[in-house]
């Protein structure tokens, strides 16, 4: 039985040229995380593997930084970065949990940031 849930930063907005932290947290399960994939629509952004550590996709290397924790930092944001982002937690023994975050990148200098999510 998959009892876990993924908490995410939800819908967030950020300013063009700025940076944002994408964060997910798996709770309510004893399952152990073996890998986390970060995807934008169908594009793989980054992987954090229990054995191998972080791997950032070559096309995002300049603008994506690993962490904090299992999260992901997007830098030098453009309007084209607007869209859905997914954290995919591969766990033992439950299997796969997926969280969704919607990011809106605003041209305006008055971007309202959602409440920053902190992993306890």
């Amino acid at each position: 039985m998959m009892t876990g849930t993924i908490e995410t930063t939800g819908n967030i907005s950020a300013e063009k040229g700025g940076s944002i932290i994408l964060q997910c947290h798996l709770s309510s399960t004893t399952a152990q995380v073996t890998q986390v994939n970060w995807e934008q629509q169908d594009q793989l952004l980054a992987i954090c593997n229990a054995d191998l550590g972080w791997h950032i996709s070559p096309s995002f290397k300049d603008r994506v930084a690993p962490g904090p924790g299992l999260g992901l930092t997007l830098q030098s944001l453009t309007v084209n970065d607007t869209g859905e982002y997914f954290c995919i937690y591969h766990t033992y023994p439950d299997g796969t949990y997926t969280g969704r975050i919607f990011l809106e990148v605003l041209e305006s200098s008055v971007a309202e940031h959602g409440a920053r999510f902190q992993i306890p």
Epitope: M1, M2, T30, Q32, T34, Q35, A50, D51, Y92, T96
Partner: antibody, heavy 121, light 112 residues
């Protein structure tokens, strides 16, 4: 390479306690869950439960709740199985078995060599 | 608990001949995540078990291709295309979909 080395055979009297160890090497201990499996003499295999080596949280099969305790010492990459109030029917080989790396949806990827616990007066 | 019933319990086979072991679960073993965690283990005399097949039909790393798994629903089969001397031992089916995870009683394969 991944290795799980268990402690040696134990002979115990009924009512006593025993602590079996499973020392891991060849990987980061806290990355992968550890299972415990029992095999009574001439019998089949029974899954006892597992412990999350990152959080230390154990999960026990119903038949192994109460007298059986899973624990860890992450500083020495070791998982432990403690059995209290031993009974003759606890006589068995006890195995530790590690969770798999990412990409393999198996329950037990690597096994220790087993520890024989004999309970006899 | 899910009961895993194996047959036969003893299987004498001639070297080079095929062998087949059947396993039936008392209920569906499809996990809530959609996977079927049906595995086959080999335990050679005096050794620890090792996984041969997982998720019904996937061969584990290093397992010879003479071993294959099949099945669905509640009926599953392990086949050895040509039995070799090193295949002697006890074979267990196992379900890891529903807690408590459970094993079959085992099938002892011996050379005729």
């Amino acid at each position: 390479q991944v290795q799980l080395v268990q402690s040696g055979s134990e002979l115990k009297k009924p009512g006593a306690s025993v602590k079996v160890s499973c020392k891991a090497s060849g990987y980061t201990f806290t990355n992968y869950g550890m299972n415990w499996v029992r095999q009574a003499p001439g019998q089949g295999l029974e899954w006892m439960g597992w412990i999350n080596t990152y959080t230390g949280e154990p999960t026990y099969a119903d038949d192994f709740k109460g007298r059986f305790v899973f624990s860890l010492d992450t500083s020495v990459s070791t998982a432990y199985l403690q059995i209290s109030s031993l009974k003759a029917e606890d006589t068995a080989v006890y195995y530790c078995a590690r969770a798999p790396p990412y990409g393999y949806d198996v329950r037990f990827a690597y096994w220790g060599q087993g520890t024989l616990v004999t309970v006899s007066s | 608990d899910v009961v895993m019933t194996q047959s036969p319990l003893s299987l004498p086979v001639t070297l080079g001949q095929p062998a087949s072991i059947s396993c039936r679960s008392s209920q569906s073993i499809v996990h809530s995540n959609g996977n079927t965690y049906l595995e086959w283990f080999q335990q050679r005399p005096g050794q620890s078990p090792r996984v041969l097949i997982y998720k019904v039909s996937d061969r584990f790393s290093g397992v010879p291709d003479r071993f294959s798994g099949s099945g669905s629903g509640t009926d599953f089969t392990l086949k050895i295309s040509r039995v070799e001397a090193e295949d002697v031992g006890v074979y267990y089916c196992f379900q890891g979909s529903h807690v408590p995870w459970t094993f079959g009683r085992g099938t002892k394969l011996e050379i005729k």
